[in-house]
Interface confidence: medium
């Protein structure tokens, strides 16, 4: 991937809109198609004011952990869908798109150097465990995906890209 491609806001926005589109096709989070078992996902809540004061290294850890758990969650949803009797085609398409999107975003973050931030020296305090929650519908899963991208990921890339511009 070209260096700093993720710093072009249109790139991240494309993935966010894809995730929101997926949320919309699942016909609402109350009555939409359910997952046959609950899936653990990252808690997307962002305390904006606290986040703004965090070191970029701490932000990177939260983003990387979240992205990793989200990828696992969507792969798990894909497996559950494959095992169902008649998986809706549109749902499969959006799950596939989400998996592809997360892989691309992971590559883009690597290029940005997000992984370097994870190599903390031995004397540093270990990061707080990632807050998680469980979801029981595809709609909620896609909502978490969209919220994670436009929350922590967008804030983190915005900060790193701004620093790179200085």
């Amino acid at each position: 991937a070209p260096p700093r491609l993720i710093c072009d806001s249109r790139v991240l926005e494309r993935y966010i809109l894809e995730a929101k589109e997926a949320e919309n096709v699942t016909m609402g989070c109350a009555e939409g198609p359910r997952l046959s078992e609950n899936i653990t996902v990252p808690d997307t809540k962002v305390n904006f004011y606290a986040w703004k004061r965090m070191e970029v290294e701490e932000q990177a850890i939260e983003v990387w952990q979240g992205l990793s758990l989200l990828s696992e969650a969507i792969l798990q949803a894909q497996a559950l869908l494959a095992n169902s009797s008649q998986p809706p085609e549109t749902l499969q398409l959006h799950i596939d798109k989400a998996i592809s999107g997360l892989r691309s975003l992971t590559s883009l973050l690597r290029v940005l150097g997000a992984q370097k931030e994870l190599m903390s020296p031995p004397d540093t305090t270990p990061p707080a465990p990632l807050r998680t929650l469980t979801v029981d519908t595809f709609c909620k899963l896609f909502r978490v995906y969209a919220n994670f991208l436009r929350g922590k990921l967008k804030l983190y890339t915005g900060e790193v890209c701004r620093r790179g511009d200085r």
Epitope: E13, L17, K20, K45, V46, N47, F48, Y49, R150, G158
Partner: antibody, heavy 127, light 108 residues
Framework: QVQLQQSGPGLVKPSQTLSLTCAIS??????????WNWIRQSPSRGLEWLGV?????????DYAVSVKSRITINPDTSKNQFSLQLNSVTPEDTAVYYC?????????????????WGRGTLVTVSS | SYVLTQPPSVSVAPGKTARITCSGD??????VEWYQQKPGQAPVLVIY???DRPSGIPERFSGSNSGNTATLTISRVEAGDEADYYC??????????FGGGTKLTVLG
């Protein structure tokens, strides 16, 4: 139930300083889970967010770009209130000024939502 | 600076559904709030995070946000819903941006 009570003069002369105070009941200005904002509303500019202060083991503030060079928001912990000072005012600053509380750390967007508002103070800038 | 655009007015008959739009460049990637303001009063938060309702706000109020447009939907409109409605978003690092407002008129 959080309540915000505003006070301050309704008339300010051009080039002078506009000063308003917002007294808080039902919460603390130095709460670690709240943020305290000033917002104004005028027919020409509509609703306009001016700035925020919040306490997270120390005090922080953020100001709107449009007023950054003229604005100060300060807490007064002894009186559980916060104030707005806007310097070098012009007739363009004539507006209804509101104080408002937002609650960081809620659902993804709620931290920016203004859930509690003062009643508003009409401030006229005129000689 | 970021701009949110709303129609100046929307009219609806009682019992019908009102839809108020708010548009901005790629608005779907930001969180949107909606405020209701009646004459002489401070705004009241009716929707936050695109579609969530604070406690005390009737279920008749709902929101959505996708692409370039956020929509506030008020179903089974009542006379008491007549007010100005403002969308808002934290579209930049520290500034909150408000739309220009939409006057909702309940006919009859």
């Amino acid at each position: 139930q959080v309540q915000l009570q505003q006070s301050g003069p309704g008339l300010v002369k051009p080039s002078q300083t506009l000063s308003l105070t917002c007294a808080i009941s039902g919460d603390s200005v130095s709460s670690n889970t709240a943020a305290w904002n000033w917002i104004r509303q005028s027919p020409s500019r509509g609703l306009e967010w001016l700035g925020v202060i919040y306490y997270r083991s120390k005090w922080y503030n953020d100001y709107a770009v449009s007023v950054k060079s003229r604005i100060t928001i300060n807490p007064d912990t002894s009186k559980n209130q916060f104030s707005l000072q806007l310097n070098s005012v012009t007739p363009e600053d004539t507006a209804v000024y509101y104080c408002a509380r937002s609650v960081p750390g809620g659902d993804p967007g709620l931290e920016h939502a203004f859930a509690y508002w003062g009643r508003g103070t009409l401030v006229t800038v005129s000689s | 600076s970021y701009v949110l655009t709303q129609p100046p007015s929307v009219s609806v008959a009682p019992g019908k559904t009102a839809r108020i739009t708010c548009s901005g460049d790629n608005l779907g990637t930001y969180y949107v709030e909606w405020y209701q303001q009646k004459p002489g009063q401070a705004p009241v938060l009716v929707i936050y995070d695109d579609s969530d309702r604070p406690s005390g706000i009737p279920e008749r109020f709902s929101g959505s946000n996708s692409g370039n447009t956020a929509t506030l939907t008020i179903s089974r409109v009542e006379a008491g819903d007549e007010a100005d409605y403002y969308c808002a978003s934290f579209a930049s690092w520290s500034d909150s941006v408000f739309g220009g407002g939409t006057k909702l008129t309940v006919l009859g």
